[in-house]
Amino acid sequence: YNNFRRSMDSIGRRQYQVQHGSCSYTFLLPETDNCRSPGSYVPNAVQRDAPLDYDDSVQRLQVLENIMENNTQWLIKLENYIQDNMKKEMVEMQQNAVQNQTAVMIEIGTNLLNQTAEQTRKLTDVEAQVLNQTTRLELQLLEHSLSTNKLEKQILDQTSEINKLQDKNSFLEKKVLDMEDKHIVQLRSIKEEKDQLQVLVSKQNSIIEELEKQLVTATVNNSVLQKQQHDLMETVHSLLTMISPSKSPKDTFVAKEEQIIYRDCAEVFKSGLTTNGIYTLTFPNSTEEIKAYCDMETSGGGWTVIQRREDGSVDFQRTWKEYKVGFGNPSGEHWLGNEFVFQVTNQQPYVLKIHLKDWEGNEAYSLYEHFYLSGEELNYRIHLKGLTGTAGKISSISQPGNDFSTKDADNDKCICKCSQMLTGGWWFDACGPSNLNGMYYPQRQNTNKFNGIKWYYWKGSGYSLKGTTMMIRPADF
């Protein structure tokens, strides 16, 4: 009978024993202790740092390769052994029981081959598992490395942010403390100022009371003085009459009074009043008065302002009469009045300066070295000579001068009524390159306007200016 047994020897090596009648064959296989069985494999059981696991896997792979190599060598040896050493027995067996022995040997060979194939397959499986595990571990390692980097970066960023915030906080705390200190100081000084002001107010109140008393006294004194002056004048008058009946005393006193009458701002300036502001001027050869704004700063001062545009607060679409006598507020938008300008510019040669402002912060001027107006019978026709300045080389007031036109007095050279078309009173041509009395348009609405505040040779046809000032001064100032 045949008996086929597989067992382990005392030191754990696998052995295959074949019993055939009185013959016993024992095969010792190479050691495979380093190969773990698939059941002992625990996936993802990472117990320590990945790099050590990885080295371990490499080592195990090397051992497995060695085992495979050993198995292969052993199989070759087995084949050789069977071929060489079994020849004798084969002969004997052939003699005794050829068929039976052959069957046994075939069975043994088959079993051995099966066993080897099984072992090889298992080894291949283990190798594949090890490779898979290695790959998986490598990926995990890479992921861990990336996430560690990411976390480290986040921690660094947060740390930096925290530091920044701490710095900022410290700075703000310091600032708040500083401000508190400042506020305390300021409050103290304000309180002191308030106390001082209260003292000052009470002082001023008493001064005012004193002045009021003095004023009452002065008024009384003034009345007395006026009466005395009147009496004296009468006495002088009678004395003069007695001495020289042919000479009128009135002339002497009128001449004295004329010294405090100002025909224009140049006279105001020359009298020592050199502050910008509104002054009362008197028409030449008349007692009629007019309030005018005097510019005492521009180009040496002494300028009588005859027109100003600055904010659109005054309507310039006015009648002939209104342009004749003037309108508006001398310290703001206004037209001084054609009649006064006609009269004053016919006394002596005057210069005209026109100052312009656009909406982009630019300023320019036109200066006419000789300027005067004709009288009302000639429609206050404008006369200009000698243009200089930065608001255009060509005059934006048409030359020769045109008559003045208003909505109710059409004296222009257009088939239309320019004053009606373009609004405002002006020395229109047909209708011409300027109109400083046009509609006032605010910023961003000041372009593409037919009827705005126009000075063609500075800003072109459709541009409406931000501000204008027309002022006059004697040429010999």
């Epitope: 078309m421 209708c431 063609y456 459709g462």
Partner: antibody, heavy 121, light 107 residues
Framework: QVQLVQSGAEVKKPGSSVKVSCKAS????????MVWVRQAPGQCLEWMGY????????GYNQKFEGRVTITADESTSTAYMELSSLRSEDTAVYYC??????????????WGQGTLVTVSS | DIVMTQSPDSLAVSLGERATINCKAS??????VAWYQQKPGQPPKLLIY???TRDTGVPDRFSGSGSGTDFTLTISSLQAEDVAVYYC?????????FGCGTKVEIK
């Protein structure tokens, strides 16, 4: 005699630009404003803008603001109108015309022969 | 923008008869109105400005009138060469605007 001669017809793709020229002769180019007016098929006349060749000042119809640019070359007495971001609705005859007055954009006394601009993909 | 509304859209008149075209402005334009004549394939031609002034070389059969918001162009005795489209135009304020035209034909 006073004459305005415009450039020839143009066919343009949507989104592109067109530049039409207008050469003036028979008068002093800088003495009058030049306007551009267009006439789409079956539509009203439409004022696009003007240029004052004396100082280069321009004014545009808000409808075309940002798309139209009017320029002038004094040396050649030529005005130009460029319209960008063309669309099919811009298909029209474009005219240049002279204003009667330098200082104001009044009425238009001399016209160019017109330039047909077709916008088609 | 000021809207200029022309009426009628078209007009058929016998030769030698009067043709009247109206134009209404959406707001007061004073007398800042011009009239143009446009024949097929030609640019517009100025006829009237400042509502009633004929341009140089324009026959006296053409006349304009009106102020404020209502304006009229009259052809006193229609001639064959007057067949055209007529446009009114306001230049009182920016942007200048045009009517959409009145086509005049011979009946």
């Amino acid at each position: 005699q006073v004459q305005l001669v415009q450039s020839g017809a143009e066919v343009k793709k949507p989104g592109s630009s067109v530049k039409v020229s207008c050469k003036a002769s028979g008068y002093s180019f800088t003495d009058y404003n030049m306007v551009w007016v267009r006439q789409a098929p079956g539509q009203c006349l439409e004022w696009m803008g003007y240029i004052d060749p004396y100082n280069g000042g321009t004014g545009y119809n808000q409808k075309f603001e940002g798309r139209v640019t009017i320029t002038a070359d004094e040396s050649t007495s030529t005005a130009y109108m460029e319209l960008s971001s063309l669309r099919s609705e811009d298909t029209a005859v474009y005219y240049c015309a002279r204003t009667r007055d330098r200082y104001d954009v009044w009425y238009f006394d001399v016209w160019g022969q017109g330039t047909l601009v077709t916008v088609s993909s | 923008d000021i809207v200029m509304t022309q009426s009628p859209d078209s007009l058929a008149v016998s030769l030698g008869e009067r043709a009247t075209i109206n134009c209404k402005a959406s707001q007061d334009v004073y007398i800042a109105v011009a009239w143009y004549q446009q024949k097929p394939g030609q640019p517009p031609k100025l006829l009237i400005y400042w509502a009633s002034t004929r341009d140089t070389g324009v026959p006296d059969r053409f006349s304009g009138s009106g102020s404020g918001t209502d304006f009229t162009l009259t052809i006193s005795s229609l001639q064959a060469e007057d067949v055209a489209v007529y446009y009114c135009h306001q230049y009182s304020s920016y942007p200048p605007t045009f009517g959409c035209g009145t086509k005049v034909e011979i009946k």
